[in-house]
């Protein structure tokens, strides 16, 4: 019969014949022949292959380097890679979490719009009129100015984006 030009799913073409691919978690030892099946072997410890494949070497699990602030979020298996994440208070510097940096703080005059997560940094926003932040913080939002009126007081010093208003007693006219 005519040799095949294309093979079924989970097969590959070699020496004019279709051989079975190795399943995830296993690597290729030898191609099939007319008389023998494809020979596959399980990946070793700290190795994986995540697809049906004809790879002769398994991939090494990723190393989550503690010197770069990384820790294991999910341990790898023979079919999946290790997933790294950052230690508390740090966030990844790329999608694949190459390394970690400290969450940044929002300077005075800025408040936290979104608190940092393991994969994204703190998002700061300038305090709008009527709000202030007098601290550098990774979690404090902008605070509203004190309402002097509700305390039966008057504004003695206007607030800024970094300072609260200063309230004082009302000047009462003597009779």
């Amino acid at each position: 019969p005519e040799p095949p030009t294309a093979c079924r799913e989970k097969q590959y073409l070699i020496n004019s014949q279709c051989c079975s691919l190795c399943q995830p978690g296993q690597k290729l030892v030898s191609d099939c022949t007319e008389f023998t099946e494809t020979e596959c072997l399980p990946c070793g410890e700290s190795e994986f292959l995540d697809t049906w494949n004809r790879e002769t070497h398994c991939h090494q699990h990723k190393y989550c380097d503690p010197n770069l602030g990384l820790r294991v979020q999910q341990k790898g298996t023979s079919e999946t890679d290790t997933i790294c994440t950052c230690e508390e208070g740090w966030h990844c510097t790329s999608e694949a979490c190459e390394s970690c940096v400290l969450h940044r703080s929002c300077s005075p005059g800025f408040g936290v719009k979104q608190i940092a997560t393991g994969v994204s940094d703190t998002i700061c926003e300038p305090c709008p009129v009527g709000f202030f932040s007098n601290v550098s913080s990774a979690f404090e939002k902008c605070h509203p100015w004190t309402s002097c009126e509700t305390k039966d007081l008057v504004v003695q010093q206007a607030g800024t984006n970094k300072t609260d208003v200063v309230c004082g007693p009302q000047d009462r006219l003597r009779a």
């Epitope: 991939h59 999608e95 190459e98 940096v101």
Partner: antibody, heavy 112, light 112 residues
Framework: VKESEGGLFKPTDTLTLTCTAS????????MSWVRQAPGNGLEWIGA???????YYASWAKSRSTITRNTNLNTLTLKMTSLTAADTATYFC?????????WGQGTLVTVSS | DIVLTQTASPVSGAVGGTVTINCQSS??????LSWYQQKPGQPPKLLIY???NLASGVPSRFKGSGSGTEFTLTISDLECADAATYYC??????????FGNGFGGGTEVVVK
């Protein structure tokens, strides 16, 4: 990692380069494209993140597309509207700002 | 895009001596900076990552330091084989629409 052959292109042509990775899984790493014009420095084109997000330099954003095929373990760069200024050696590399594994690079020449 | 400004070329040093290359970033990139060595006709080679970490197989004569916007690569006990062009690369990533990446212009090191 190994890039596909570059070659000679005409202005306005579209460039498609493929990078094949072995011994590691593309889906676990950020992968970047970098180019270098003859006698010049390195220029970051863009990257695809481990989770599949795509990132481009502002000059490349409008005419570049980076994709990956995790089954074939390949990375592709497509760049449209080529000009002579795109003449360069194109590298694929593993990482984002820690490019620890580079291809040998492939020369792309754009000339009429 | 991030702009990285490197020490102007060339930088000269005698065998056994020390050279220093500076890299200044237009944005605060924390410690997210790498240094590469490139020789003619070859792809770049990672020397230092995360500002101060020595890449695998790189001799301890190479030392990286700095954080934020100012970074330095110091090569001590210079050898003839250190003659090359050195590049810094820096970036940050904080989600799909908040990122930056770029290379410095390169600094040629001449060993006398």
């Amino acid at each position: 990692v190994k890039e596909s052959e570059g070659g000679l292109f005409k202005p306005t042509d579209t460039l498609t380069l493929t990078c094949t990775a072995s011994r590691f899984s593309l889906s676990s790493y950020d992968m970047s494209w970098v180019r270098q014009a003859p006698g010049n420095g390195l220029e970051w084109i863009g990257a695809i993140g481990g989770a599949g997000g795509t990132y481009y330099a502002s000059w490349a954003k409008s005419r570049s597309t980076i994709t990956r095929n995790t089954n074939l373990n390949t990375l592709t760069l497509k760049m449209t509207s080529l000009t002579a200024a795109d003449t360069a050696t194109y590298f694929c590399a593993r990482g984002w700002t820690r490019l620890d594994l580079w291809g040998q690079g492939t020369l792309v020449t754009v000339s009429s | 895009d991030i702009v990285l400004t490197q020490t102007a070329s060339p930088v000269s040093g005698a065998v056994g001596g020390t050279v220093t290359i500076n890299c200044q970033s237009s944005e605060d990139i924390s410690s997210n900076l790498s240094w590469y060595q490139q020789k003619p006709g070859q792809p770049p080679k990672l020397l230092i990552y995360a500002a101060s970490n020595l890449a695998s197989g790189v001799p301890s004569r190479f030392k990286g330091s700095g954080s934020g916007t100012e970074f330095t690569l110091t090569i001590s006990d210079l050898e003839c084989a250190d003659a090359a062009t050195y590049y810094c690369q820096g970036g940050y990533w904080s989600g799909i629409s908040n990122f930056g990446n770029g290379f410095g212009g390169g600094t040629e090191v001449v060993v006398k």
